[in-house]
Amino acid sequence: KFSKQSWGLENEALIVRCPRQGKPSYTVDWYYSQTNKSIPTQERNRVFASGQLLKFLPAAVADSGIYTCIVRSPTFNRTGYANVTIYKKQSDCNVPDYLMYSTVSGSEKNSKIYCPTIDLYNWTAPLEWFKNCQALQGSRYRAHKSFLVIDNVMTEDAGDYTCKFIHNENGANYSVTATRSFTVKDEQGFSLFPVIGAPAQNEIKEVEIGKNANLTCSACFGKGTQFLAAVLWQLNGTKITDFGEPRIQQEEGQNQSFSNGLACLDMVLRIADVKEEDLLLQYDCLALNLHGLRRHTVRLSRKNPIDHHS
């Protein structure tokens, strides 16, 4: 339980934290597990202990092995183990799995890729970022503090991202690289209280007596698959089918999915041969889903024919 795997590349800095935690005032002793030999604390050594941290400046393949740390307090001792593996640098671009840190996934709304282990090091901005070994260029990529932000994430942004920074120790600089995979997941769907785009609330629609008229009820319900979303018309609070006027029918419009991903529905009310009595009716556009029901009311008014005066 109190053993931690750490890895690094030869000739790079590697800093490892003791898996057992303690107050800053507690002393921490480090040992080579195989030999039980104490690790020096003097900074002139290439490998030295500094409290909870074990520093390889720089690391060598021969440093691979298990290191023991003992956190000592006045009342107890706690032991932890750091399993360190130092690998030779690869000549090609591929980063092998054993050098990869945990995969992170991002989406349209959240596309931060944190540079792994960076908080252990004494580094200064800027951080350099590479994707599949290529330096990232373009305004979509922003190195911000210890993470990379990608604007307008797309599925093509998935891949292996490497951060590179310089660790400074007593005026000496050491390079560090760390790589992790980034996957892109589709933003999950969501649903909203229905939003009626048309008609406007209490809209007055001008119609001509004897002509046909169309009213469209259009509403959006969220993004992705929508459960039990519906739009419909009512006449004087009654369903069209129950109203019993064959001249007035509703017809499902197209299911729309706009470029912003919103799921919307249309219902067209068709009135054939508009009559005077149609002007007295209340036309309700209803949009409903599991969140609730929204109603917009429309009334018809007579369109005055244009007078032709000489």
Epitope: F193, L228, L286, L290, G292, L293, T297
Partner: antibody
């Protein structure tokens, strides 16, 4: 007052179907969804599905998909739940429940289940 | 599916004492668009259908005594009966209506000590 009245107890043979009715009164039937929930003896509550009476749209729990059909008859303000291919594990009390709503002139905000039927006991036994 | 987990499974409280039931959802039931928690609490007495007590996590249904209160947000919710009465002996369920399928907690049985 608002109430949901369910049909009486049923005893069914394995493999058969049962249809439970739920008659609503005291409110505008078309404006509220109806849920169906069941409760096996000594067990908790299990949501089966929902119907939107106006459009007749339904959504079912995956577990019951293909075996359950929920319908509504606006003319009688009645919702129905039919469960087919009955097995002994379907022995339970079946409830209909109306979705709760905060109502203003032009909005209904739906929440939970505010009115429940009295329950219909369905026993599946050979 | 969102899994609702209640604790404890049963609870024995003296008359007049406070009873607290917890409910945890496997994912948040807080809708950011309206800042509402889609969570309800029900009371069920033997041989009766459930009765809605609380909705939107903290709004008391009309007619429910004010000794019943709901609190919490996101994934962690609590139903509190401030002063237990004999008629409060029942099984209590939490339920999310954030997404389909709607799901209930397994229930908490409240008894008198």
């Amino acid at each position: 007052q608002v109430q949901l009245v369910q049909s009486g107890a049923e005893v069914k043979k394995p493999g058969s179907s049962v249809k439970v009715s739920c008659k609503a009164s005291g409110y505008r039937f078309t404006d509220y969804y109806i849920h169906w929930v069941r409760q096996a003896p000594g067990q908790g509550l299990e949501w089966m599905g929902i119907i939107q009476p106006t459009g007749g749209g339904t959504t079912y729990a995956q577990k019951f998909q293909g075996r359950v059909t929920i319908t509504a008859d606006e003319s009688t303000s009645t919702a129905y739940m039919e469960l087919s291919s009955l097995r002994s594990e379907d022995t339970a009390v079946y409830y209909c429940a109306r979705v709760g709503a905060t109502v203003t002139k032009n909005y209904y905000y739906y929440y939970g289940m505010d009115v429940w039927g009295q329950g219909t006991t369905v026993t599946v036994s050979s | 599916d969102i899994v609702m987990t209640q604790s404890p499974d049963s609870l024995a409280v003296s008359l007049g004492e406070r009873a607290t039931i917890n409910c945890k959802s496997s994912q948040s039931v807080l809708y950011s668009s309206n800042n509402r928690n889609y969570l309800a609490w029900y009371q069920q007495k033997p041989g009766q259908p459930p009765k809605l007590l609380i909705y939107w996590a903290s709004t008391r249904e009309s007619g429910v005594p004010d000794r019943f209160s709901g609190s919490g947000s996101g994934t962690d919710f609590t139903l509190t009966i401030s002063s237990l009465q004999a008629e409060d002996v029942a099984v209590y369920y939490c339920q999310q209506y954030y997404s389909v399928p709607l799901t209930f907690g397994q229930g908490t049985k409240v008894e008198i000590k």
